[in-house]
């Protein structure tokens, strides 16, 4: 038998060489297109296991899009035809709650999750006899990657997990299904940086295959929370990085989400974008914002993919995406997942399992309406899945998809066998569909979230709500004391109230100057390298938030450290959530906050508000009866008509949909 090369096994403390054999065909080679279903017998630790695999229909689309750039930097859009892909999910026969994510492209490669252990399998290099190596994921050497929590804390957490008998996976899964009965769909966009692309030999196909494999692994991990991962886009920075990746992880994350908001959202709708980087950040495996999955400005994360396997990397991306989905670190909380460590442990443990805490954190996000964008089943032209009637995703050529025949019995609008609408139905799903009919134009489908938001209405001829828009960044709010920024009025008092309760308000400026000049975890202007940055006096209002009149101590699923600083007859209150170095600190002043006359906070600096590019003269453009929205169109006040709020009418904008029902004048205001 061939012996594995040093490179292939140097990261393993133990492994076996096995030869899987296929049950469903006499010969090993599968003619293309790949089979929809296939079974293998594999050996692990002296036992034979029968594994049953089914192509992951929900993973990739008919119009799978890959963005790359040519030498001149021009964007190239490619639709590679990968309908009959080779990425599978499945289970191990006779092993309760087992799950598998495997590719069968060039041999078997992937992850097998059994009840008490996870295994990796990959083809043995240079073998001509279909030999593979199989190993426990626990036996993979991993660089100790930090998430801002000391090793002592991690050891203590691990020791505690070993002492206690964790509940079985069955119990956890049963509980989670009760907590999260409705399937959520994360429309994921992956961006691969230039260095990672170079590392893959500048082979776009290899990068694409690896990222599809990654998405399949993510799907296999998230399915236990009733969350499906749908890969809606891949961009490879083939010609050079489109953001500055110099600096700390926080700087790069900030640059990435700004780029995403400016360039990516407009090109391809998605819920979260994850940047895959080769460059490391001194042991930090990644970084992401918490609870921002549906945010236009912050739904993103960065993930370091250096000298590790894609199987190990999958748990890093699962972790950072978990942050976007509202999940905090498990450390210091009473969490269990049926394994020594869980995905949201801060130590980047390579775990495949989400903990009970992660399920609760995600449930909190959904209860607080932070996950509304996850309810839509991706549209046919957005979902990267090989079309398949019955996968609950509306693929190209389908009008609806109610799932299995049993599920379709409960759907009054959709014909399950054909994935077409029933003869009397106009629609089967969507915010503007009710009882198989389009809701009338003028039905409110997305209310305002703040004074800087505008409502959207059904248009009467579509099942979908109009796209979400808000008041243009830079519009004054809070009686000219603040500016609108990404649909929120950003001002200190409101931020203090979110953290310290409804009576809290901003501390005096002296507090900000005194505390933020220290450059420690309780007072700083961000992080540079391995240390906190002191705030210059002019930037002090953009560092750690300082509040007074505090009557409530915050609890956000994680207990923060609170500091009180006496200053000129008042107490300044600040907070450190200790979320770890891979999570931006919610105790900092929010971006877009007005820090002086005509100035706002950006990247912990107080800069000229002109960076917001607000260019709307509401008196001229909207005749004093409206505001400009984020598409730079007038949204008219009730009583005035779009597009320019010049004549009498019923409010709204060219983007909002009609604000009243044209067929029913009784509804007119």
């Amino acid at each position: 038998a061939a012996r594995p090369g040093f490179q292939q096994t140097s990261h393993l403390s133990s492994y076996e060489i096995i030869t899987p054999w296929r049950l469903t065909r006499e010969r090993r080679e599968a003619p293309r297109p790949y089979s929809k279903q296939v079974s293998y017998v594999i050996q692990a630790e002296g036992k034979e296991h029968i594994i049953h695999l089914e192509r992951n229909k929900d993973l990739l689309p008919e119009d799978f899009v890959v963005y790359t750039y040519n030498k001149e930097g021009t964007l190239i859009t490619d639709h590679p035809n990968i309908q009959n892909h080779c990425h599978y999910r499945g289970y191990v026969e006779g092993v309760h709650n087992s799950s598998i994510a495997l590719s069968d492209c060039f041999g078997l490669r992937g992850l097998l999750h059994l009840e008490n252990a996870s295994y990796g399998i990959e083809p043995l290099q240079n073998s001509s006899h279909f030999e593979h190596i199989i190993y426990r994921m626990d036996d993979v050497y991993k660089e100790p990657l930090k998430c801002g929590v000391s090793n002592k804390d991690i050891e203590k957490e691990t020791a505690k997990d070993e002492e206690e008998e964790p509940p079985s996976m069955t119990q956890l899964l049963r509980r989670r299904r009760a907590v999260l009965p409705q399937t959520r769909y994360v429309e994921l966009f992956i961006v691969v940086d230039k260095e990672r692309y170079d590392m893959m030999g500048r082979n776009q196909t290899a990068v694409r295959e690896e990222m599809i494999l990654l998405a399949n692994y993510l799907d296999s991990m998230y399915i236990m929370l009733n969350i499906r991962i749908v890969l809606v886009g891949l961009e490879i920075w083939t010609n050079g990085n489109l953001i500055n990746i110099v600096g700390g992880a926080g700087d790069v994350l900030g640059n990435f989400v700004q780029w995403r908001e400016k360039f990516l959202i407009t090109r391809r709708r998605h819920d979260s974008a994850q940047l895959v980087l080769k460059k490391g950040f001194g042991g930090t495996a990644g970084m992401a914002f918490v609870g921002t999955v549906c945010s236009r400005s912050h739904a993103g994360g960065i993930n370091v993919f250096g000298q590790i396997t894609v199987e190990t990397f999958a748990s890093i991306v699962a972790h950072e995406l978990g942050h976007n989905l509202g999940m905090n670190h498990d450390d210091g909380r009473d969490c269990s997942c049926g394994a020594k460590s869980c995905i949201m442990n801060s130590g980047a443990s390579g775990s495949r399992n989400f903990s009970s805490c992660s399920a609760e954190d995600f449930e909190k996000l959904t209860l607080n309406k932070g996950g509304n964008c996850l309810l839509n089943i991706p549209k046919p032209d957005e979902a990267y899945s090989a079309p398949s009637c019955g996968n609950k995703l509306v693929d190209a050529g389908e009008e609806c998809d109610c799932g299995t025949p049993k599920e379709c019995e409960l759907d009054p609008c959709c014909e399950g066998s054909t994935c077409k609408l029933k003869s009397f139905a106009e629609c089967a799903y969507g915010d503007c569909c009710k009882d198989c009919r389009f809701l009338p134009g003028g039905t409110l489908c997305r209310g305002k979230t703040s004074e800087c938001d505008v409502p959207e209405y059904c248009n009467g001829s579509s099942q979908f709500c109009q796209p979400d828009v808000f008041i243009q960044n830079g519009y004054p709010c809070q009686n000219n004391k603040a500016y609108c920024y990404n649909g929120m009025c950003q001002y200190y008092d409101a931020q203090c109230q979110v953290i310290f309760g409804s009576k809290a308000k901003a501390a005096p400026k002296d507090c900000f100057i005194e505390v933020n000049s220290k450059g420690d975890r309780f007072g700083n202007c961000g992080f540079s390298g391995n240390e906190y940055k002191k705030c210059a006096t002019g930037n002090a209002l953009c560092g750690k938030l300082q509040c007074e009149n505090v009557q409530e101590i915050p609890v956000f699923g994680i207990v923060p450290a609170i500091i009180q600083t006496p200053s000129r007859g008042t107490k300044c209150w600040g907070v450190d959530f200790q979320l770890g170095s891979d999570v931006p600190d919610p105790g900092m002043v929010n971006e877009g906050t007005k820090c002086g006359a005509g100035k706002i906070c950006r990247n912990f600096q107080c800069v000229d508000a002109s960076v917001l590019n607000y260019d709307c003269d509401v008196q001229k453009k909207c005749h004093g009866h409206g505001v400009c929205n984020s598409n730079k169109n007038c949204h008219c006040e009730n009583g005035w008509a779009p597009p320019n709020c010049e004549t009498k009418g019923y409010g709204g904008s060219v983007d909002s949909g009609p604000t009243y029902n044209e067929m029913n004048t009784a509804l007119r205001d």
Epitope: L444, G447, K448, T449, S450, E451, D453, V454, P455, H635, E637, N638, G639, Y650, G651, G652, T659, Y660, A666, L667, R668, D669
Partner: nanobody
Framework: EVQLVESGGGLVQPGGSLRLSCAGS????????MGWFRQAPGKEREFVAA????????YYEDSVKGRFTISRDNAKNTVYLQMNSLKPEDTAVYYC???????????????????WGQGTQVTVSS
């Protein structure tokens, strides 16, 4: 900028009546749909009634239909809530509210409204 001030609250016996007023200032008041909301101790704020800016349409929360009437006098920049057959469960702080963009039919579902009064207490008790 619109300012709203409520008045007319007080203590009343079950079955009794009260009339709340909401006086508005600001040039745009007469073009705003207006609503009444209430918040009982330990409960979320809830929609009660709304009236369109031309006073042609009104909307009510189910539990107050037939008992409460919303009206407005644009010449006086005032909105009223006439409450009859009051019940103990109507006890709450009553707020008058409005928004530049909200139509009356959507007032209860809008999620966030621009203008709020400070509230007036209504207590129904024997």
């Amino acid at each position: 900028e619109v300012q709203l001030v409520e008045s007319g609250g007080g203590l009343v016996q079950p079955g009794g009546s009260l009339r709340l007023s909401c006086a508005g200032s600001g040039r745009t008041f007469s073009r705003l749909a207006m609503g009444w909301f209430r918040q009982a101790p330990g409960k979320e704020r809830e929609f009660v009634a709304a009236i369109s800016w031309l006073a042609e349409t009104t909307y009510y929360e189910d539990s107050v239909k037939g008992r409460f009437t919303i009206s407005r006098d644009n010449a006086k920049n005032t909105v009223y809530l006439q409450m009859n057959s009051l019940k103990p469960e109507d006890t709450a702080v009553y707020y008058c509210a409005s928004d530049r963009f909200a139509t009356a039919q959507h007032m209860g579902a809008m999620g966030s409204l621009d203008y709020w009064g400070q509230g007036t207490q209504v207590t129904v008790s024997s």
